[in-house]
């Protein structure tokens, strides 16, 4: 029912320009890796890589953060950079890869009963697109981040993956971010071989789960590299 969907659902990713969709074997319709929202940069293939400019972390992918590419660089020139792995230096949570957070300047695992210090954060949608609520309520969503007992369940609004329960990540859904399932073996994933090459997806997928990597499907061969289907596969 609609109520159960409103309570429990999540969103992943949308189709590319025509010809970029890769059909899932046996499927009547396409499974595909990403489309840009109006105003986003052009859909780019891996070979046509350009750094994706950003103003804040939320404009980048789940495994990226927004910063100046050079230390002490011009603050006006920021791009999406690869997230920092465990034990790497950091200045804020968003710099650390999913499943980690920034503690005392170092990325550490968020499994260690970490609770963010902020009491409340507000998501304001301002992407130049119209956002109407179905029930007429405010477009501004206040997200309580004081998650001492529960973390966001599937479909809950989030700011970053540490807001979400185990097995979920925080990924874009239209012009918000919600908790979505981390991908399992065999599921279609979005491959960003070069950071920032993805543009900004309306429906963003989570990353592949532990022990899995996003790789081209062995039996899926097409002329265009950008249109090949990627799935989560065992290392």
């Amino acid at each position: 029912t609609l109520n159960s969907v409103l309570n429990s659902n999540a969103i992943k990713n949308l189709p590319p320009p025509l010809g970029g969709a890769a059909g899932h074997p046996g499927s009547a319709v396409s499974a595909a890796p990403g489309i840009l929202y109006p105003g986003g940069n052009k859909y780019q293939t891996i070979d046509n890589y350009q750094p994706y400019p950003c103003a804040e972390d939320e404009e980048c992918g789940t495994d990226e953060y927004c910063a100046s590419p050079t230390r002490g660089g011009d603050a006006g020139v920021q791009i999406c950079l690869a997230c920092r792995k465990r034990r790497k230096r950091c200045m804020r949570h968003a710099m650390c890869c999913p499943g980690n957070y920034c503690k005392n300047g170092i990325c550490v695992s968020s499994d260690q009963n970490h609770f963010r210090g902020e009491i409340e954060e507000t998501i304001t949608e301002s992407f130049g697109n119209d956002h109407s609520t179905l029930d007429g309520y405010s477009r501004r969503t206040t997200l309580s981040s004081k998650m001492y007992h529960t973390k966001g369940q599937e479909g809950s609004v989030c700011l970053r993956s540490s807001d979400c329960a185990s097995g979920l990540c925080c990924a874009r859904h239209f012009w918000s971010k919600i908790c979505k399932p981390v991908l399992k073996e065999g599921q279609v994933c979005t491959k960003h071989r070069r950071k920032g090459s993805h543009g900004l997806e309306i429906f963003q997928r989570c990353y592949c789960g532990e022990g899995l990597s996003c790789r081209i499907q062995k039996d899926h061969h097409q002329a265009s590299n950008s249109s090949r289907l990627h799935t989560c596969q065992r290392h």
């Epitope: 409103l6 659902n9 969103i11 990713n13 499927s27 396409s30 595909a32 609520t133 179905l134």
Partner: nanobody, 117 residues
Framework: EVQLVESGGGLVQAGGSLRLSCAAS????????MGWFRQAPGKEREFVAG????????YYADSVKGRFTISGDNAKNTVYLQMNSLKPEDTAVYYC??????????WGQGTQVTVSS
Amino acid sequence: EVQLVESGGGLVQAGGSLRLSCAASGRTFSSYGMGWFRQAPGKEREFVAGISWTLGRTYYADSVKGRFTISGDNAKNTVYLQMNSLKPEDTAVYYCASDESDAYNYWGQGTQVTVSS
């Protein structure tokens, strides 16, 4: 297997209206949101309007705001696009897209909308 079927396209004069429908069949799982996209000849596919069951919101591209209305019934696996005050620049193939809980993203084959001046 999931199938998305769009209908309602056609030839209409500028200023006219059309109502597109998209029905999903064969679904054994839930949709989290659906959207309409369009692709004009020689152009990239672009977002037109979307509806999020999860967040209870609708979304529109600036170019269609105030003219197009998206609606839907998740229980019936159906989404609609009411297009009023159509312009020649709205001419395109319109695609319906559905985002599903099985982690695949499904979308249909498209329906042609032609607006003559």
